[in-house]
Amino acid sequence: AGVFELQIHSFGPGPGPGAPRSPCSARLPCRLFFRVCLKPGLSEEAAESPCALGAALSARGPVYTEQPGAPAPDLPLPDGLLQVPFRDAWPGTFSFIIETWREELGDQIGGPAWSLLARVAGRRRLAAGGPWARDIQRAGAWELRFSYRARCEPPAVGTACTRLCRPRSAPSRCGPGLRPCAPLEDECEAPLVCRAGCSPEHGFCEQPGECRCLEGWTGPLCTVPVSTSSCLSPRGPSSATTGCLVPGPGPCDGNPCANGGSCSETPRSFECTCPRGFYGLRCEVSGVTCADGPCFNGGLCVGGADPDSAYICHCPPGFQGSNCEKRVDRCSLQPCRNGGLCLDLGHALRCRCRAGFAGPRCEHDLDDCAGRACANGGTCVEGGGAHRCSCALGFGGRDCRERADPCAARPCAHGGRCYAHFSGLVCACAPGYMGARCEFPVHPDGASALPAAPPGLRPGDPQRYL
């Protein structure tokens, strides 16, 4: 028997770009709490029941209100350790899930609302009685720093908390063959009752004469390491060296959902659909009935008629999820069209429309030309919700109200001189060029690249452009 202890040091934005928005605001103050779930063994597919080593919930942290404009700092944490007592031997290898939850304290109907802010998971080796192990885990843009240890509860001692200590029978020393129980030097090890030769490091017993192995060890005396598969290479194509065919990547490969949960891929990861009675990211939280009060936010718990339906939460308006743990963000219904920004105001949805669009759902493409005349013979052109006038020659500006200098763009090629004219512009071409813009060279033999000039006009004469 013993206790696994978890100390959270900090929870805040991780390094690098994309700092997360503060989870709390002046309008919606909140506080954090943590949940830890422990499973024995390193294998994620282990058949043990969920949180078989135990689970614990922290106290609520101090209330936090974001300072406007300030980046999200490390958030204030609950006091004290999270302690998970374990009754049997400490397995030496274990899997953990640490969840950071946010409790919103605004004017909630039906009390505060909880939402999962971050979840980290890992697999570790740890001997009981050792020093604190430090760890840093990242979940999205958040970073969690924590320490953990496993310690045995007297009279148990040892790396697996399987050796027992008893008070000394004599004041000065322990009995024959028995050592003092460090660090309890005034106690002695109880006589070993395991099978003779049972590995003291990798085996333990709960009944006289038996030898049970810790994760990763096998054999009658727990002295043989479990041979690992030769296919421990990362996901990818088959390895010529091992001859293993490793499946291609897929978040649902090997079904990460426990307890009969079904896995479906999402664009970012995967989602487990849990049988009723189980919940959590991987359906790892189990055995819940209405007596456990699994429905958050005032959800009504109804017991199911069969084991597949241990309970169901009927959520009050504004909440969803199998435990009513999620606030319904009606913007997830994607109600706004044409790139409009969705705002869920609680009592109503609002769409903030991009320029050129209107309507409660930004569904109307504004006819920008309606009621907007372009002056001086210009014509209105629509495009992407933006209004534009195509102006007649000699005019410019947004509404064609400005008289344009037709020569401003230097339209006459090859050194031709431009003259503004009431009907447009005239180019006086340099010798050797002709055309409305002086764009055509006159051939040396006098022939033009164009059809012959109209009667009365010689190459080099000003060409009026109408």
Epitope: T266, P267, R268, E271, P317, Q320, V328, R330, S332, L333, Q334, P335, C336, R337, A348, C351, P360, R361, E363
Partner: antibody, heavy 117, light 107 residues
């Protein structure tokens, strides 16, 4: 034009799993949430929930929590409905429908699922 | 949940008639009321959204009205192709709910 085409009819035994597909075309798939509606034989329409096609996050009506899962294959503009541990009362026609901000404006033709031992 | 009630489960009318189908909500839902048509072959189409707006491609003989908790769908000049079951649906509060349907038949 806008179309939602669903997979064909399914005949299953109790306890089995079924996965229905809904392939969208004629619009940008990730701009509109996809909804699922159940119609038991001779009965009315019952809204099951939706999936946000941009994030993949689903939302389920109370009666469809647990054995039902909505998912996406965005690259194929396809939404899926999976029903696990089928029961006789899951016998129904299931529709997918696009939501335009006001209503479910385009519907699939429906997929009939029959659960019988 | 908002309950939607279509008191008339079936209705007989003659071609050319003006037909009104009603729908009542258990609570006010801000005009987020839609009407759908389900043909005998099972296909479902949106007719009217947001109480009175006609969906694109729907004939103008269909119209919707109402407010608060009472809403109605009107077909001004019944045609043979209108033989179907009509469902109302509220889209204001989750979960969305449908009326039980009104089956329209020809006399």
């Amino acid at each position: 034009q806008i179309q939602l085409v669903q997979s064909g009819p399914e005949l299953k035994k109790p306890g089995e799993t079924v996965k229905i597909s809904c392939k969208a075309s004629g619009y940008t798939f990730t701009d509109y949430s996809m909804h699922w509606v159940k119609q038991a034989p001779g009965k009315g329409l019952k809204w099951m929930g939706w999936i946000n096609t941009e994030t993949g996050e689903p939302g389920y009506a109370d009666d469809f929590k647990g054995r039902f899962a909505f998912s996406l294959e965005t690259s194929a503009s396809t939404a899926y409905l999976q029903i696990n541990n089928l029961k006789n009362e899951d016998t129904a026609t299931y529709f997918c429908a696009r939501y335009d901000g006001y209503a479910m404006d385009y519907w699939g033709q429906g997929t009939s699922v029959t659960v019988s031992s | 949940d908002i309950q939607m009630t279509q008191t008339t489960s079936s209705l007989s009318a003659s071609l050319g008639d003006r037909v009104t189908i009603s729908c009542r909500a258990s609570q006010d839902h801000s005009n987020h009321l839609n009407w759908y048509q389900q043909k005998p072959d099972g296909t479902v189409k949106l007719l009217i959204y947001y109480t009175s707006r006609l969906h694109s491609g729907v004939p103008s003989r269909f119209s919707g009205s109402g407010s608060g908790t009472d809403y109605s769908l009107t077909i001004s000049n019944l045609e043979l192709e209108d033989i179907a079951t009509y469902f109302c649906q509220q889209g204001d509060m989750l979960p969305w709910t449908f009326g039980g349907g009104t089956k329209l038949e020809i006399k």
